[in-house]
Amino acid sequence: TPEVWVQVRMEATELSSFTIRCGFLGSGSISLVTVSWGGPNGAGGTTLAVLHPERGIRQWAPARQARWETQSSISLILEGSGASSPCANTTFCCKFASFPEGSWEACGSLPPSSDPGLSAPPTPAPILRADL
């Protein structure tokens, strides 16, 4: 069964800067990745970035750099300043659209006990969404 994992890390050097990493554990080819915060995309969440493996990457503040890390994982750096900056309990979600599996989404946030620079463990929490 395909799974999506999400890892959220606060940067030790910039306490209001976050790195979100997401990956897809499945055999299908990924057609689109959507990263959102504040909840799942389409369910109250706000889109931060949309990544297509070949067409390119779209990102919106406070996202600073979205990129593919491998063919099945992405990372996103958020810079925090002002009202739109993330906080420690912000939920980040990654939705992977894959053929032929469908659409899979998982969410994660910084653990309450996290010290700056420590990673939250990858949290596979797949949600099958039949919206392709």
Partner: antibody, heavy 114, light 113 residues
Framework: EVQLVQSGAEVKKPGSSVKVSCKAS????????IEWVRQAPGQGLEWMGE????????NYNEKFKGRVTITADESTSTAYMELSSLRSEDTAVYYC???????WGQGTLVTVSS | DIVMTQSPDSLAVSLGERATINCKSS????????????LAWYQQKPGQPPKLLIY???TRESGVPDRFSGSGSGTDFTLTISSLQAEDVAVYYC?????????FGQGTKLEIK
Amino acid sequence: EVQLVQSGAEVKKPGSSVKVSCKASGYTFSSFSIEWVRQAPGQGLEWMGEILPGSNSTNYNEKFKGRVTITADESTSTAYMELSSLRSEDTAVYYCSSYWFAYWGQGTLVTVSS
Amino acid sequence: DIVMTQSPDSLAVSLGERATINCKSSQSLLNSGNQKNYLAWYQQKPGQPPKLLIYGASTRESGVPDRFSGSGSGTDFTLTISSLQAEDVAVYYCQNAHSYPPTFGQGTKLEIK
């Protein structure tokens, strides 16, 4: 079928503003950004900015920052590009586009002339 | 901003012959993580909006004839029309799809010799 239909041609005076609309259909409007690109007569293509209708998040080309405002109305699946403080060199065809420039509107000619 | 430079500015090719347009970017368009190049090619005919031909440097958009092909990596890219048809007369643009702002080449005008 994806369609982007733009408003008609405009003639404007220097110093005034113009607002061009782009009505989208055939796809989920909120999910993909609408880009705005302009093309002066006989010239190349110049990206102005974009909006993600679902969150109203925008990115602008630094060249146009302060003069261009891009908005979207999800209820009508329509995006808007407003350009202010018009000058003669803003005379161009203005295009909206979506899904990584795979789909384009027909273009709107804006003529700035006194 | 990434600067896109096309060559030549104009090109005249006989019907049925091969046409080649080059595009050079001032920075690499290769995403090392997935080894994809974020470069697109467009065709624009007079009075019409641009039409996407190629994305990811080499992937043809749906419905684009297979005589159009894209190649290259990093900073150097090529659009090839294997056998020129009359309807291919147009201006062709390359585009940086790697980073903001998306930037276009100055265009190459393709005519029939």
